[in-house]
């Protein structure tokens, strides 16, 4: 089958590479500077990808593959193949048009990246606030209310009291 | 422009060795693509092995493992050695830049 594939179709020869020259009888020629071909049987090799301005190059381009872009520092990478960078905020923060916002009570935020979201609701599980939220991080849920009845208390008991006349050594 | 002159080629038994040679001269200084080519007896010309833009070797898969691919920047010159030579080998090798190619050199292989 690959023998009468490359009979009916010269260019499928062509290795990752290289691009089937229409110019030169559809021989396979090397892909010219700052192009590349990734996959064989390729009638162009596509031109480089750039990372310029706010992307740098974290892998150059060869003649087989594409170069690949991350952000600078104080950026991050959005879309498939970091197509887009967008700048970071701290965290308790999130993005809007008119730039870093701090997230509003009741949401928070623990990453650099992302929009504020809203604490979580002890209640709903039936549970207790352990730890008060903050705009950086979420609340910590405790034990149902019914947990911390008398008799079922599961905060550590406190130390007994030394016995009187008994003074530390 | 480039003007490109292979040797070495020649008549060789199955099996034996061959190093072919491609001299440049002119402004090879811009050229950035080095490739061998060569052409069987009513064939099409095609590619055996290149030097990529970003200096990496590569090969057709009839040379890989048997061929090398190699150059000298100060002689200006490429070098294609050809190992385990099989009938099929035998063809017109050319070196190849840009727009520029050699004349070719006639490579045998016959018992």
């Known amino acids: 089958f690959e023998r009468t594939r490359s009979l009916q179709d010269p260019c499928s020869n062509c290795p990752a590479g290289t691009f089937c020259d229409n110019n030169r009888n559809q021989i396979c020629s090397p892909c010219p500077p700052n192009s590349f071909s990734s996959a064989g049987g390729q009638r162009t090799c596509d031109i480089c990808r750039q990372c310029k301005g706010v992307f740098r190059t974290r892998k150059e381009c060869s003649s087989t593959s594409n170069a690949e872009c991350d952000c600078t520092p104080g950026f991050h990478c959005l879309g498939a193949g970091c197509s887009m960078c967008e700048q970071d905020c701290k965290q308790g923060q999130e993005l809007t048009k008119k730039g870093c916002k701090d997230c509003c009570f009741g949401t928070f935020n623990d990453q650099k990246r992302g929009i504020c979201r809203p604490w979580t609701n002890c209640s709903l599980d039936g549970k207790s606030v352990l730890v008060n939220g903050t705009k950086e991080r979420d609340v910590v849920c405790g034990p149902s209310p019914a947990d911390l009845s008398p008799g079922a208390s599961s905060v550590t008991p406190p130390a007994p009291a030394r016995e009187p006349g008994h003074s530390p050594q | 422009a480039v003007q490109l002159v292979e040797s070495g080629g020649g008549l060789v038994q199955p099996g034996g060795s061959l190093r072919l040679s491609c001299a440049a001269s002119?402004?090879?200084?811009?050229?950035?693509?080095w490739s061998w080519y060569r052409q069987a007896p009513g064939k099409q010309r095609e590619l055996v092995a290149w030097?990529?833009?970003?200096?990496?070797?590569h090969y057709t898969d009839s040379a890989k493992g048997r061929f090398t691919i190699s150059r000298d920047n100060t002689k200006k010159t490429m070098y294609l050695q050809m190992n385990s030579l099989k009938l099929e080998d035998t063809a017109v090798y050319y070196c190849?830049?840009?727009?520029?190619w050699g004349q070719g050199t006639q490579v045998t292989v016959s018992s």
């Open positions: 030097f990529a833009w970003d200096n990496i070797a």
């Open positions: 002119g402004n090879i200084f811009s050229i950035r693509v």
């Open positions: 190849n830049s840009g727009d520029s």
